[in-house]
Amino acid sequence: SKAVGIDLGTTYSCVAHFANDRVDIIANDQGNRTTPSFVAFTDTERLIGDAAKNQAAMNPSNTVFDAKRLIGRNFNDPEVQADMKHFPFKLIDVDGKPQIQVEFKGETKNFTPEQISSMVLGKMKETAESYLGAKVNDAVVTVPAYFNDSQRQATKDAGTIAGLNVLRIINEPTAAAIAYGLDKKGKEEHVLIFDLGGGTFDVSLLSIEDGIFEVKATAGDTHLGGEDFDNRLVNHFIQEFKRKNKKDLSTNQRALRRLRTACERAKRTLSSSAQTSVEIDSLFEGIDFYTSITRARFEELCADLFRSTLDPVEKVLRDAKLDKSQVDEIVLVGGSTRIPKVQKLVTDYFNGKEPNRSINPDEAVAYGAAVQAAILTGDESSKTQDLLLLDVAPLSLGIETAGGVMTKLIPRNSTIPTKKSEIFSTYADNQPGVLIQVFEGERAKTKDNNLLGKFELSGIPPAPRGVPQIEVTFDVDSNGILNVSAVEKGTGKSNKITITNDKGRLSKEDIEKMVAEAEKFKEEDEKESQRIASKNQLESIAYSLKNTISEAGDKLEQADKDTVTKKAEETISWLDSNTTASKEEFDDKLKELQDIANPIMSKLYQAGGAPGGAAGGAPGGFPGGAPPAPEAEGPTVEEVD
């Protein structure tokens, strides 16, 4: 089986594979090198990627996107609450976590963000398998460097649900740095990766020398990206539409989706043009919306967001104890770095230093992830043999001590993996357990930080207060995920201590159930695509027969021509009124059609009237005869999936 790198993006995802000293970015079934991180549910099927995004306007309430803005977060997270206001799909609170509620095949279904992300990952897995012609089991999956523990763990779970062995979770800017520096030899360079994507923003500062990639500091915003710029445009045009037409289109989800798509397109155009027009026919209540926007106006609408990208830049320089003049290269990653104003802000901040443009901003992350996947699975390329990746934990980890104080155990920007042990004891005689509350964040008080989990140590042997010596080890692994273990030092009865880990993540049972459900969905998708293939084949052959007969001239008797034409038209008419029929029904109809048409088509064939045949051509009949001849020599039938 093969190993791949997957950039699981907020808006688009990308998959790559490293072999024979090079990385291949793998195109999907539509020929696109990035795939929309969209999943849609309809009455008959589940759609993922381009197909899902393309029908979003027709089916807004059941087309799910932005799972990355939900994954590993609590329902009451202020950012989830803010996002909810403009999501066309329904979010519900299940045990304090957000779930997406949709109508699928006539039933109401709830999905966790992990499940939605797993569907996107599954699509990337299939894309790679089609291209590589082999099973893909192993993957390195990327996350924003500033993702916290819960978000990382949830992303890893999404990979598991997709049937992947997640070799490693790596940080997006670090992966991009590999793409930039893989072929770099020579002196030490300080490289600043500025990664502004569809929904997240990271800045990492690395030193790269002789194959050693050492992250010095990282900062970012897990809720800033291209979608926020789209939102500004959408809101601007909603107001304009109100002014012009005295109507509020924001009440209509289909109109909003059409407007958002137009805004996304306009934003892209404004990266290369100073002005663009937006033209949407019958946008709302039959009103056409024709307008234009300039680059200057767009920059004004997003000014505060663009400016805010410099805060993490300053923070990483401060944390790395470097002056901006010591940065050798600035590497721009993520589609949103194509925005000229963003580029200008960065260039101006670095006193006119131009960013390095040697890597593709859409593909660099998947590229680096593929290199790391190759390393972790034993690829012996000379390009990877010298690579050493030293990444950091983005947030300080600590525990709550008396008075709600945040006592840091692992400071932010600590090289990972890392371990820290601390001795705890009891505060009451014969106390059977200790509650340890773990937080992540930089504030002095735990109430201002993020509660990562509560770890209950139970089974402590009876003893006076302060006597038990419980050594708790905090271990941040190479994925940036925290694991906690404990030993009762005083008595050596470590096996008596159990840790109840309440990190709010999916349980092993949940994941197993979701894996099984994912398999079921995959089988249903497969069934549906076979059903569509049978439908298309029947339709294709019916039309092809009709055309062939109409061009047969006097090579067939009129009665024969009428028989085939009548049956073909009858089939087409049946298809129109039975679009949801089963595969078996389509196959039966095809057999009926063949039984009538084959003997007559054989006559035509013998008369030399249909070389190559209508559908396979040789007397073998439909389908499965000889391969179709070139177009000039007679009609061919194309099977459409």
């Epitope: 002789d210 972790l376 034993g378 012996e380 000379s382 043999q385 690579l387 050493l388």
Partner: nanobody, 110 residues
Framework: QVQLVESGGGLVQPGGSLRLSCAAS????????LNWHRQAPGKQRELVAT??????RYADSVKDRFTISRDNEKNTVYLEMNSVKPEDTAVYYC?????WGQGTQVTVSS
């Protein structure tokens, strides 16, 4: 599957010497960069020494005192520690290809 097993740690007096070994398996040893890292109590994990195709490199704190070497026949990488100081007390980890050993404790104390 990549496996890295460190040995040779222990208690050593200041100014003394120690030789750490790391036996590796599961990958083409001779062609890959090999690394020694350490983590002292309450400190960050740091890269101490590394040996790649361009030869060895050392952290400033151990330059001229520690030597990293490899034996490709035995699939083993060594860290020769001389003139040790109390601040060299740490758990020493061997790493390669993104994988880590379990570590070996070195304590420098009189």
């Amino acid at each position: 599957q990549v496996q890295l097993v460190e040995s040779g740690g222990g208690l050593v007096q200041p100014g003394g010497s120690l030789r750490l070994s790391c036996a590796a398996s599961g990958f083409d040893f001779s062609r890959n960069r090999l690394n020694w890292h350490r983590q002292a109590p309450g400190k960050q994990r740091e890269l101490v020494a590394t040996i790649g195709s361009n030869g060895p490199r050392y952290a400033d704190s151990v330059k001229d005192r520690f030597t990293i070497s490899r034996d490709n026949e035995k699939n083993t990488v060594y860290l020769e520690m001389n003139s040790v100081k109390p601040e060299d007390t740490a758990v020493y980890y061997c790493a390669a290809r993104g994988y880590w050993g379990q570590g070996t404790q070195v304590t420098v104390s009189s």
